[in-house]
């Protein structure tokens, strides 16, 4: 867990993050494990430490080895290990398995390929993308931020995709490449504008003062795995966490259920010890995905403890 494999190509930039994460204020010391020699922090060095990051600008095959990072808080020191391997550049087109990042899957509706490790680097758009060493051209391919989008994905789009970008450090530019496999799932999924199953729009929920009450926000977003979908509650237009009433909490986590093949989510709002002032609040069940946002509003009304039906003579 706290030993992480990292790899790169000679003469390219490689930046490695300490596998032992800490708060931003903590100091991090880096050592070359074999010699216990401290890694310098001065940026004039080809290999230097910069907080949580260890930078090889550029990397050399001889840099391969295990590096130790010690994260220091005021009272605790915690250790991580980065196992770095730098490979010689291949003369041919094939990318060996040991240089491949994790495989990603796509489908007709969701075909994003993220460029691995790019968040560690200081890069500027656009990314260059290659498939099996060929530069990608044509309107079906769109390089967007740190990912590639392929329109109308077909099974022939499966293959090895390489992203190439430039890392800038103090005015100097270094090339970085990263490759991962892309597989295509034949998935008949689809995404819809959210449909809220509960609560009904402008529903009045009867509650008893002093008792606990639960409100469930339930919505469906289409069929199959959804790329982005969420349900949440708001109080008077404010997020629950920002509202500041500890009696009112959203149930932790969201469970994705597939009833009738539909992808649905629900979020339970728990109100402990219902008070009079809770009846004055507006409770909004929000469901959102890439298509947009739908909102159903609920209000609470007082339920008499003895709720006899009226008897008409």
């Amino acid at each position: 867990k706290f030993s992480k494999q990292s790899w790169g190509l000679e003469n390219e930039a490689l930046i490695v993050r300490c596998p032992r994460q800490g708060k931003p204020s903590y100091t991090v010391d880096w050592y070359y494990s074999q010699t216990n020699k401290s890694i310098p922090t001065q940026e004039r060095n080809r290999v230097f430490a910069s907080g949580q990051l260890l930078k090889f600008l550029p990397a050399a095959v001889a840099d391969s080895g295990i590096y130790t990072c010690i994260v220091r808080s005021p009272t605790f020191n915690r250790t991580g290990y980065a196992n770095v391997t730098i490979y010689k550049k291949q003369s041919d087109c094939n990318v060996p398995d040991y240089l491949m990042y994790s495989t990603v899957s796509g489908s007709e509706k969701n075909s994003k390929i993220y460029c691995p490790t790019i968040d560690l680097y200081n890069w500027t758009a656009p990314l260059e993308w290659f498939k099996n060493c060929q530069a990608l051209q044509g309107s079906r391919y769109r390089a967007h931020k740190s990912f590639l989008v392929i329109d109308n994905v077909m099974t022939e789009d499966a293959g090895d995709y390489t992203c190439k970008f430039i890392h800038n450090e103090n005015g100097a530019n270094y090339s970085v490449t990263a490759t991962r496999s892309f597989t295509v799932k034949d998935e008949q999924g689809f995404s819809l504008f959210p449909v809220i199953g509960a609560p009904a729009q402008n529903e009045i929920k009867e509650v008893e003062i002093g008792k606990n009450a639960n409100l469930t926000c339930s919505a469906c977003f289409g069929k199959g795995t959804q790329f982005l979908a969420a349900v949440l509650w708001q109080l008077n237009g404010t997020k629950i966490t920002d509202f500041g009433e500890p009696r009112i909490q959203q149930e932790e986590g969201q469970n994705q259920s597939f009833s009738n093949g539909l992808a649905c989510l629900d979020m339970v709002l728990r109100i402990a010890d219902v008070k009079e002032e809770d009846l004055l609040l507006q409770y909004d069940c929000l469901a959102l995905n890439l298509h947009g946002l739908r909102r159903h509003t609920v209000r609470l009304s007082r339920k008499n403890p003895i709720d006899h039906h009226s008897i008409y003579c």
């Epitope: 867990k1 706290f2 800490g22 708060k23 808080s73 915690r78 966490t241 932790e252």
Partner: antibody
């Protein structure tokens, strides 16, 4: 000096509610994850709940999920545990404790503990 | 959830003797394991974190070892103030869990 002081314990009937507080001092409360741990009389320690420093993510033991709510007021340096639908098996000393390290998605040890407050659920 | 099993339940030793306490996890916790000491009427006190690191102010006679599923707390030479209950705790994932405790008592 780091100090945690629990309050709000007492005798309550089954089905009743209680709200525990933990007043923190001697450290920057808002950046630390906070935890409730309980210990039934003569028994071992049981983790109850964790809340992240910024107050966003919360985690609960299955035994209290849906009945207990952890919250915090960073402006008052105070941690809370709202306990509803109390049962006899909730009888315990409740400790609040600090996690001195955690980053989102991870947990760590408990380096400072309060002295505990006793909650007794009995009719 | 990850179950931690401590053994023995009770350890009867004399001051100056070596104490060896065991904690076994139902699945790997890497080195995300801590040891606490608790005396009657007091809150627990952190002794060891990340399986083998002593917390600030903890005497050198306390040491921890192990990784994965098997862990050991060793007290090299028991002092009178070391007689207490000791708990292990994993923090690799929620729910955080504790062992049931080992009581170290005076023989």
């Amino acid at each position: 000096e780091v100090q945690l002081l629990e309050s709000g314990g007492g005798l309550v009937q089954p089905g009743g509610s209680l709200r525990l507080s933990c007043a923190a001092s001697g450290f920057t409360f808002s950046i630390y994850d906070m935890i409730w741990v309980r210990q039934a009389p003569g028994k071992g320690l049981e983790w109850v709940s964790t809340i992240r420093g910024e107050g966003g993510s919360t985690y609960y033991a299955d035994s209290v999920k849906g009945r207990f709510t952890i919250s915090r007021d960073n402006s008052k340096n105070t941690l809370y545990l709202q306990m509803n639908s109390l049962r006899a098996e909730d009888t315990a000393v409740y400790y609040c404790a600090r996690d001195p390290w955690s980053t989102e998605g991870s947990f760590f040890v408990l380096d400072y503990w309060g002295q505990g407050t006793l909650v007794t659920v009995s009719s | 959830e990850i179950v931690l099993t401590q053994s023995p339940a009770t350890l009867s030793l004399s001051p100056g003797e070596r104490a060896t306490l065991s904690c076994r996890a139902s699945q790997s916790v890497d080195d995300d394991l801590a040891w606490y000491q608790q005396k009657p009427g007091q809150a627990p006190r952190l002794l060891i974190y990340d399986a083998s690191n002593r917390a600030t102010g903890i005497p050198a006679r306390f040491s921890g070892s192990g990784s994965g599923t098997d862990f050991t707390l060793t007290i090299s030479s028991l002092e009178p103030e070391d007689f207490a209950v000791y708990y292990c705790q994993q923090y690799i994932t929620a729910p955080l869990t504790f062992g049931q405790g080992t009581k170290v008592e005076i023989k």
